[in-house]
C-alpha cells in the first residue's frame, strides 16, 4: 500500500535568463528511494540513482545542475522552459510517486528596465 | 520494465574496431538517455557514450574521436562503433538506459578485449 505524499513547490515563476530551484519531497512513507526522475513533459532532464549517483541528460548539461539535495537548478532560463516539470520518485517497495511543478518563465520586469533610464 | 540485450564484444587486435549493440525492449516509450559504461579490473565503473532520443550525444575524453554513439528510435537500439582501440579500452561495457518515467536499467555486461 502506497502510503507517501509528495510536496512540491508547485507554480512557480522566475525572470528570463536567470534561475530556479525544482523542488520534490516525499514524506509519510518508510519507502526506500531508488531513484528520482526529472522530466519535462516529454523531455528528461536528470536523474539521481542510488548507485550512479546524479546523472544529467547531454541535451541539459550545459543549464542544469543536480541538487540541492534530490531538487534540481535549471539556470539561463528562456521562455520556452515554460510548462510542467515531474520529479517521479522510484521507490521500494510502495512504487513509483510523480509530483508536479508549473514553472512560466517571464520577461524582465518593466520596474527592473525602467530603473536603468533617468527621467528628465 | 525495460530489458537490454547487448552484443558485439570480443577479442580484437591494437588499432582494431568494434561494434557493440545494445536493443531495449519492454516499456520503451518516451524520451531517454541510452548509453555504456565500462569497467575494467580493479578499477571503477566509467561513462564511456550516451544518447538521447533527439541524438545529443557525450563522451569520456579518452574516447572522444575514437569512439561514435549512434541509435536506430525505430529498433530501440543504441550502438557503439570503437575504432583506434586500446589495450586501455579492455574491459567489461554495459549498456545502461532510462526511459521516460522509468527506472535505470542495466545490461548484462559484454567483454571487449583488446589485446596482440
Known amino acids: 500500500m502506497m502510503t507517501g505524499t509528495i510536496e512540491t513547490t508547485g507554480n512557480i515563476s522566475a525572470e528570463k535568463g536567470g534561475s530556479i530551484i525544482l523542488q520534490c519531497h516525499l514524506s509519510s512513507t518508510t519507502a526506500q528511494v531508488t531513484q528520482v526522475n526529472w522530466e519535462q513533459q516529454d523531455q528528461l532532464l536528470a536523474i539521481c540513482n542510488a548507485d550512479l549517483g546524479w546523472h544529467i541528460s547531454p541535451s541539459f548539461k550545459d543549464r542544469v545542475a543536480p541538487g540541492p539535495g534530490l531538487g534540481l537548478t535549471l539556470q539561463s532560463l528562456t521562455v520556452n522552459d515554460t510548462g510542467e516539470y515531474f520529479c517521479i520518485y522510484h521507490t521500494y517497495p510502495d512504487g513509483t510517486y510523480t509530483g508536479r511543478i508549473f514553472l512560466e518563465v517571464l520577461e524582465s520586469s518593466v520596474a527592473e528596465h525602467g530603473a536603468r533610464f533617468q527621467i528628465p | 520494465e525495460v530489458q537490454l540485450v547487448e552484443s558485439g564484444g570480443g577479442l580484437v587486435q591494437p588499432g582494431g574496431s568494434l561494434r557493440l549493440s545494445c536493443a531495449a525492449s519492454?516499456?520503451?516509450?518516451?524520451?531517454?538517455?541510452m548509453g555504456w559504461f565500462r569497467q575494467a579490473p580493479g578499477k571503477e565503473r566509467e561513462l564511456v557514450a550516451e544518447?538521447?532520443?533527439?541524438?545529443?550525444?557525450n563522451y569520456a575524453d579518452s574516447v572522444k574521436g575514437r569512439f561514435t554513439i549512434s541509435a536506430d528510435n525505430s529498433k530501440n537500439t543504441a550502438y557503439l562503433q570503437m575504432n583506434s582501440l586500446k589495450p586501455e579500452d579492455t574491459a567489461v561495457y554495459y549498456c545502461?538506459?532510462?526511459?521516460?518515467?522509468?527506472?535505470?536499467?542495466w545490461g548484462q555486461g559484454t567483454l571487449v578485449t583488446v589485446s596482440s
Open positions: 544518447i538521447t532520443r533527439s541524438g545529443r550525444t
Open positions: 545502461a538506459a532510462v526511459f521516460s518515467r522509468g527506472p535505470l536499467t
Open positions: 519492454g516499456r520503451t516509450f518516451g524520451d531517454y538517455i
